[in-house]
Every structure is written in structure tokens, then in C-alpha cells.
Interface confidence: low
Amino acid sequence: ALDTNYCFRNLEENCCVRPLYIDFRQDLGWKWVHEPKGYYANFCSGPCPYLRSADTTHSTVLGLYNTLNPEASASPCCVPQDLEPLTILYYVGRTPKVEQLSNMVVKSCKCS
Amino acid sequence: ALDTNYCFRNLEENCCVRPLYIDFRQDLGWKWVHEPKGYYANFCSGPCPYLRSADTTHSTVLGLYNTLNPEASASPCCVPQDLEPLTILYYVGRTPKVEQLSNMVVKSCKCS
């Protein structure tokens, strides 16, 4: 699986999850998030050669098409597969509010 | 929606579905598919600016991150959203077989 366990331990050029730390205030301008200050959102990148973690029949077909037609601009793209939530604390006036934001942390990638 | 109705009628630079005809024999080397000879598989391409058909909270965050940090390599990618099946005819010996292949035709795209 193209997950953090594999990708963070290997120098993988092809589609894999990459570490990306995002500081809410500095990187997003989100001053309203009280905690955490930031988090590892991670992201997916790298080429999708034929059959590499293909998501659908279409991505398999497109991967083969791209292999046989390397000048073509159509190819699968490395995108998130499994995501995890992140619990944040923010304030409405002086009242603390806790909310779980879904799909915030990329744990694995796929070729789609 | 970034679907064929919209994308095929507009000169859209950002993420959209693009027409792509694939000939089974010439483009894939699949000599076993008797009919159709080929089909419009289509594909997704184009930049994913902030908030453009964002698939998850993560893609929204990544889009904003990329807007505020344009030198960053991390950005959402334009990938298939809705796919349709394709019915094909092939032969096993002299016996014709009809099969529906799932997720073969891209109808719309999203930023993931």
C-alpha cells in the first residue's frame, strides 16, 4: 500500500504520500484555529506508471495508453486514497468549540 | 459540475474532463476486443485553483496552501469523479461473450 508506513521509509519516486506540515496561521491565514497550531496534512505526488495502485479500470486503461503513447498528455494522477480526521479547537466569542474536521490527513495514495 | 456537458462546450483551462478516444487495438494492443473498435474514455486535466470542485477538506486546504505558497509542489490534482461502464464483445474460441466493464468512461472530474 502506498501509505505513510511505506512511503515515509522509502525513497520512492513514483506515486506515494509525502510529508507536508501546514501551519494554520502562517500557511493558510486561519487565525481562528486555536489548536493545534498546525498539523501534517501530507500530500500525494509522483508518476503513475501502468498498474501502480490503479484505482479503477479507467486508470488501468489510461496507464497502459500512456505507456504505449508516451507523448500523450493523458495519464493517471497520484491522489489521496485514505484520509483521517483532525480535531481542532476554536473560539466563538469566549466559548471554546471543538470540532472534528473530516478528511484532513492523507494516510495513503492511489493512481486515479 | 465539471462534466462533459460543461467541459466539452467551453474552452476551460482549469480542471475539466477532456475528450480522449482510445482504439483498443492501436492504442492498447488489445486485439481480443471485437467491438467496439474503440471508445471515448476521456480524461481529466487542468490546474486545480483554490475551491475548484474540491473533493475533500484536504483538497480545500491544499488548494489554499498552494495559493498562498505558489512555489510549493503540493497541490490538488484533477481526477475522475463520475465514471460509466462500457459494454464490449469478445470471443472465447468461436463463442461470442458480452461483458460490461465498469468505470471505463469519465463523465466528470474533481480536484482531489
Epitope: P19, K37, Y40, P85, T87, L89 | -
Partner: antibody, heavy 120, light 107 residues
């Protein structure tokens, strides 16, 4: 690899203060909270507070406000906790721990603990 | 602040047994609960985060479940090296309170 190295045991007199340290290595010190936890002999874990080394932001649990002061030095990647007006109730092992950096979800690395004994 | 009530306080089991520890939060913490193992003379070690996510390198005999206020931690087949105290902790809102702990002893 990630390591949190705490200072050695302390024997201090009642009424005095003590400052214990937690030196971090193997990760971006500024980007993750450092928590402090108290454990009295044979007892459970008690959360004291935490500090975000990036900007010095702190939070304390009520009973440790005024008792514990958390600071951090980014240049040496070291977090400190000062305990003041010590009494026998402050005799305990104190742990520093890093908030899990990949999901900010829990404390994934802990120091070895610093034993503080308050005795005259 | 949140109170985490952990039960039981003690567990005496044999190797091979299945054990379950429960933790009840005084109010909803969504799924922001972690479980730690502390062996005698050692620092606590993270086993489970976000209620059910096994931390890297943790054997799959350790599992966590729950949402809202009720959480469970299970060791499917206890081994001799599991002798330790186990703590739950809510990681939902400061102050991040711990449960009182469960001491697991092997017969």
C-alpha cells in the same frame, strides 16, 4: 530518531524551586507541542500543561497554574518546566512528551522522566 | 474539564486470555482518545490514538474502539510481556485528562 532527553534527579528543600529540562532531537522542535505529565509513586498520570515552542504559547491545568511555568528555547531545542514553592506533594516523576506530529492526536514520544524529591 | 473514568483498576489474567478495559468520558470527546502502556520503571508508550488507530509498531493484538463517551481497549491474547499499567487519555480539549489506570497482572 526522535529523542526526548530529560535532566537528572533532583533533591530539593520545601519552599524552594526546581527547573527541569527536556532536550528534543530528531524532529522539528518548533512544530509540535511539548506536554508535561506528573506521576506520583504508585499513582496515575496527571497532565500539567503544554507549550508550543514555535511561539511560546502555553496551556495549564487549573491546579498547576502558578505552580508550574513552562518555557522553551528554540535555539537549543530544549523545553523547561519550573516548579515553585515546593512541598512534599510535589515529590514525583515528571515526564515530558511530544504531541504526535503526524496527526496531532496523542503523545507519541516520552522522555525517560525526572524524579523530584522534596525533603528537608 | 473532562473526567475519564477507567475500569477496572486491576486485572489478574492468565497468558492467552482476552481482556477489555473501558474508559468513560464525562462528556463527548468525539474519537479523540489515546491508550498508553506503562511497564514498571518505564515511561508510558502510545498504543492507540483516535480511539481505534494502532500506533506504528504496535502488535495487532491491541485494539481500541469507541466514539463519544464510551471507549474500550482490548488485548485479544494476553502475553507475559503485557504486564503493565494501561491508561486512557482524552486528547479532545485542554486539559488533557487521563483515566486512573488499569494494572494488568499475569497469573
Amino acid at each position: 530518531q526522535v529523542l526526548l532527553q530529560q535532566s537528572g534527579p533532583e533533591l530539593v528543600k520545601p519552599g524552594a524551586s526546581v527547573k527541569i529540562s527536556c532536550k528534543a532531537s530528531g524532529y522539528a522542535f518548533s512544530s509540535s507541542w511539548i506536554h508535561w505529565v506528573k506521576q506520583r509513586p504508585g499513582k496515575g498520570l496527571e497532565w500539567i500543561g503544554r507549550i508550543y515552542p514555535g511561539d511560546g504559547d502555553t496551556n495549564y491545568t487549573g491546579k498547576f497554574k502558578g505552580k508550574a511555568t513552562l518555557t522553551a528555547d528554540k535555539s537549543s531545542s530544549t523545553a523547561y518546566m519550573q516548579l515553585s514553592s515546593l512541598t512534599s506533594e510535589d515529590s514525583a516523576v515528571y515526564f515530558c512528551a511530544r504531541r504526535m506530529i503526524t496527526t496531532q492526536a496523542a503523545m507519541d514520544y516520552w522522555g525517560q522522566g525526572t524524579s523530584v524529591t522534596v525533603s528537608s | 474539564s473532562f473526567v475519564m473514568t477507567q475500569t477496572p483498576k486491576f486485572l489478574l489474567v492468565s497468558a492467552g486470555d482476552r481482556v477489555t478495559i473501558t474508559c468513560k468520558a464525562s462528556q463527548s470527546v468525539i474519537n479523540a482518545v489515546a491508550w498508553y502502556q506503562q511497564k514498571p520503571g518505564q515511561s508510558p508508550k502510545l498504543l492507540i490514538y483516535y480511539a481505534s488507530n494502532r500506533y506504528t509498531g504496535v502488535p495487532d493484538r491491541f485494539t481500541g474502539n469507541g466514539y463519544g463517551t464510551d471507549f474500550t481497549f482490548t488485548i485479544s491474547t494476553v502475553q507475559a510481556e503485557d504486564l503493565a499499567v494501561y491508561f486512557c487519555q482524552q486528547d479532545y480539549s485542554s486539559p488533557y485528562t487521563f483515566g486512573g489506570g488499569t494494572k494488568l497482572e499475569i497469573k
